[in-house]
């Protein structure tokens, strides 16, 4: 299972993606800036195990799929780019899914990092509700689209985790 | 390590034309946006604009609209502040910093060590 | 453009002082301001941001508040490098303005 390599290529590319889809200029958008509370420290003073990595991993993935998988999202990005992000992040799913089957086996997928999962969850409710609060105002997935590209590149420790042997 | 490391100082004349630099390093370039700021000789801060490198997307203040202008180089982690026809009025110390864009973060938490310009007949 | 508008323009005061300089803002800019401490010669440095947020590296007897328009910075303790000239910033919006600086004198 050689995900250090595809995983860091599939999210390089999601990044491109996700920098080109913006539609306005941000310097209008400063106002909406918003404390969304990514839980870095928590990612910070943990070593992740491969698996733990992986699922935390999917899980931020797979709230970033959903959360640009809405009608709201279809409505602000451009839709050919939106696409492509969205099939970038299906395939890093895919990839992740396989590597816990051939790591664990199918039925000893970890549950040891359910606060992990929590957490990321709780701060993607968090931008969700910041949207709805924003009345999904351009500036706000502006402010959203920043927030995901930097949670992105924060999550260096679950990559390092990736690279470990259980 | 984080660094902004600016050009070195300029003597000009009036009428010349100058462009100044700022070297990003320690961080990825593109997720900050640079952000310039004139300190006249005695006074205070003045912003004068910002670029995004990413895209060289550029927002500056109305004092320095047209006065000057900031654009950057990506590929090498540089963003500049140009001039094309300088006045003994532009004499001051150039800063330039870093901002986190729209993300919530200290604002201009790294700055360079300053370009100091004069601008003298 | 958000004026901004510090007070006072300059002090004089003694190590161990508690020393407060205040920060006005032309309109609302929620707890979007900056505090930078200037030595001669030198580059600001960030002490507090969004209003009361202290900046990784910056001595606890630094501290700020206020929300809207006014705004406060405090040293609790005034200890002999803290002899400079502060600057309040809004970062609510373009353009982005400065205070015109507090300078910080010894008594």
């Known amino acids: 299972c050689d995900l250090p390599q595809t995983h860091s290529l599939r999210n390089r590319r999601a990044l491109i993606l996700l920098a080109q889809m913006g539609r306005i200029s941000p310097f209008s958008c400063l106002k909406d800036r918003h404390e969304f509370r990514f839980p870095e420290e928590e990612f910070d003073g943990h070593q992740f195990q491969k698996t733990q990595a992986i699922s935390v991993l999917h899980e931020m993935i797979q709230q970033t799929f959903n959360l640009f998988s809405t009608e709201d999202s279809s409505a602000a990005w451009e839709q050919s780019l939106l696409e492509k992000f969205s099939t970038e992040l299906y395939q890093q799913l895919n990839d992740l899914e396989a590597c816990v089957i051939q790591e664990v086996g199918v039925e000893e997928t970890p549950l040891m990092n359910e606060d992990f999962i929590l957490a990321v969850r709780k701060y993607f409710q968090r931008i969700t509700l910041y949207l709805m609060e924003k009345k999904y105002s351009p500036c706000a997935w502006e402010v959203v689209r920043a927030e995901i590209m930097r949670s992105f590149s924060f999550s260096t420790n679950l990559k390092k985790g990736l690279r470990r042997k259980d | 390590e984080v660094q902004l490391v600016q050009s070195g100082a300029e003597v000009k004349k009036p009428g010349e034309s100058l462009k100044i630099s700022c070297k990003g390093s320690?961080?990825?370039?593109?997720?900050?946006?640079i952000g310039w700021v004139r300190q006249m000789p005695g006074k205070g801060l003045e912003w004068m604009g910002i670029i995004d490198p990413s895209d060289s997307d550029t927002a500056y203040s109305p004092s320095f609209q047209g006065q000057v202008t900031i654009s950057a180089d990506k590929s090498i982690s540089t963003a500049y502040l140009q001039w094309s026809s300088l006045k003994a009025s532009d004499t001051a110390m150039y800063y330039c910093?870093?901002?986190?864009?729209?993300?919530?973060?200290?604002?201009?938490?790294?700055w360079g060590q300053g370009t100091l310009v004069t601008v003298s007949s | 453009d958000i004026q901004m508008t510090q007070s006072p323009s300059s002090l004089s005061a003694s190590v161990g002082d508690r020393v407060t300089i205040t920060c006005r803002a032309s309109?609302?800019?929620?707890?979007?301001l900056n505090w930078y401490q200037q030595k001669p010669g030198k580059a600001p440095k960030l002490l507090i941001y969004f209003a009361s947020s202290l900046q990784s590296g910056v001595p606890s007897r630094f501290s700020g508040s206020g929300s809207g328009t006014d705004f406060t910075l405090t040293i609790s303790s005034l200890q002999p490098e803290d002899f400079a000239t502060y600057y309040c910033?809004?970062?609510?919006?373009?353009?982005?303005?400065f205070g015109q600086g507090t300078k910080v004198e010894i008594k």
């Open positions: 320690g961080y990825s370039f593109t997720s900050y946006w």
């Open positions: 910033q809004q970062s609510f919006d373009f353009p982005l303005t």
């Open positions: 309109q609302s800019i929620d707890g979007a």
């Open positions: 910093a870093r901002h986190p864009g729209l993300n919530w973060a200290p604002d201009f938490d790294y």
